[in-house]
Interface confidence: medium
């Protein structure tokens, strides 16, 4: 793997759990300042595989609020605005990292957790299984 | 708001930076064990708005590898397999949290960072601006 030279100004790591337990600064640095300002928030409605968004809140998690996509239809919307069941609306899922308070209710102690979230939906050609 | 009673077994928080700086256990707990085993990995190819996946690696970030979706076409694939430019392929983006080594090259000190990633693409009806 890539070996990174250690910075001599690093915090002390005498903790017996090191490197399992690390210090994390929660002042979030947002790298999204130069992103395309074109809003994607209406795609859920304009897509041929539209979706609804549902709010999931958990005060023991950071971020505490995550929005989950649920596809509206099994099929996709065709040019006439009708659902075409020859195509499938499917969720696009992504694994994301969140922080889980551990022990529970502790304000300054967390564990990394990986969760699968549905971000939106896309329209796919179904896999047809032909029975011999 | 919701007041969570503090757990008496919480780690000490005398750090002068508290609550900005917290302890995080990097042993990831994976909550995805009960998710549908049906793989979504082939959707990028079967979608009417197909995408390519590009590997983004940064050893100063955790996770160090993130896959970014780039839509293959401006339009969407129609029933004949051709690109229909009356529709638009657009990226579905999500803000995710990552850990950034801070100071740089430190193995046990991080800062939370928010980045915008494209997870996949969806096919949308374009917004047509009529000029008077």
């Amino acid at each position: 793997g890539i070996t990174i030279p250690r910075n001599p100004g690093c915090p002390n790591s005498e903790d017996k759990n090191f490197p399992r337990t690390v210090m994390v600064n929660l002042n979030i640095h947002n790298r999204n300042t130069n992103t395309n300002p074109k809003r994607s928030s209406d795609y859920y409605n304009r897509s041929t595989s539209p979706w609804n968004l549902h709010r999931n809140e958990d005060p023991e998690r950071y971020p505490s609020v995550i929005w989950e996509a649920k596809c509206r239809h099994l099929g996709c919307i065709n040019a006439d605005g009708n659902v075409d069941y020859h195509m499938n609306s499917v969720p696009i899922q992504q694994e994301i990292l969140v922080l889980r308070r551990e022990p529970p209710h502790c304000p300054n102690s967390f564990r990394l957790e990986k969760i699968l979230v549905s971000v939106g939906c896309t329209c796919v050609t179904p896999i047809v299984h032909h029975v011999a | 708001g919701i007041t969570i009673p503090r757990n008496p077994g919480c780690p000490n928080s005398e750090d002068k930076n508290f609550p900005r700086t917290v302890m995080v256990n990097l042993n990831i707990h994976n909550r995805n064990t009960n998710t549908n085993p049906k793989r979504s990995s082939d959707y990028y190819n079967r979608s009417t708005s197909p995408w390519n996946l590009h590997r983004n690696e940064d050893p100063e970030r955790y996770p160090s590898v993130i896959w970014e979706a780039k839509c293959r076409h401006l339009g969407c694939i129609n029933a004949d397999g051709n690109v229909d430019y009356h529709m638009n392929s657009v990226p579905i983006q999500q803000e995710i949290l990552v850990l950034r080594r801070e100071p740089p090259h430190c193995p046990n000190s991080f800062r939370l960072e928010k980045i915008l990633v494209s997870v996949g693409c969806t096919c949308v009806t374009p917004i047509v601006h009529h000029v008077a």
Epitope: R39, S41, N45, N52, V65, R72 | G1
Partner: nanobody
Framework: EVQLVESGGGLVQAGGSLRLSCAAS????????MGWFRQAPGKEREFVAA????????AYRDFVKGRFTISRDNARDTVYLHMTSLKPEDTAIYYC??????????????????WGQGTQVTVSS
């Protein structure tokens, strides 16, 4: 969960203005899209205006466009409805609400799970 309390209602002459406020208690106000609805005596509750989580996107019913403005201040956990050129038909109880799902339209009442108790607006001619 979020609790909502409206204020700023009252009696006003036709053509006058009012600013309604909706104060939220809850640590995650910034993560709720918000809306204003109103209910006149003997009528159904109806959508008036809505605003996105960040405040950079809003929507209005046709009958209030150009007269009402929705805004929010996430630092103060408050959403506002600035009403101008008020008409007697604007008389109603005004409610603010927090949205917990998106089912395609801003005005879909079932998307709003948390409601305030309402504030009365009376416009006299």
């Amino acid at each position: 969960e979020v609790q909502l309390v409206e204020s700023g209602g009252g009696l006003v002459q036709a053509g006058g203005s009012l600013r309604l406020s909706c104060a939220a208690s809850g640590r995650t106000f910034f993560s709720y899209p918000m809306g204003w609805f109103r209910q006149a005596p003997g009528k159904e509750r109806e959508f008036v205006a809505a605003i996105s989580m960040s405040g950079d996107d809003s929507a209005y019913r046709d009958f209030v466009k150009g007269r009402f403005t929705i805004s929010r201040d996430n630092a103060r956990d408050t959403v506002y409805l600035h009403m101008t050129s008020l008409k007697p038909e604007d008389t109603a109880i005004y409610y603010c609400a927090a949205r917990t799902s998106y089912n395609g339209r801003y005005d879909y009442i079932d998307d709003y799970s948390y409601w305030g108790q309402g504030t009365q607006v009376t416009v006299s001619s």
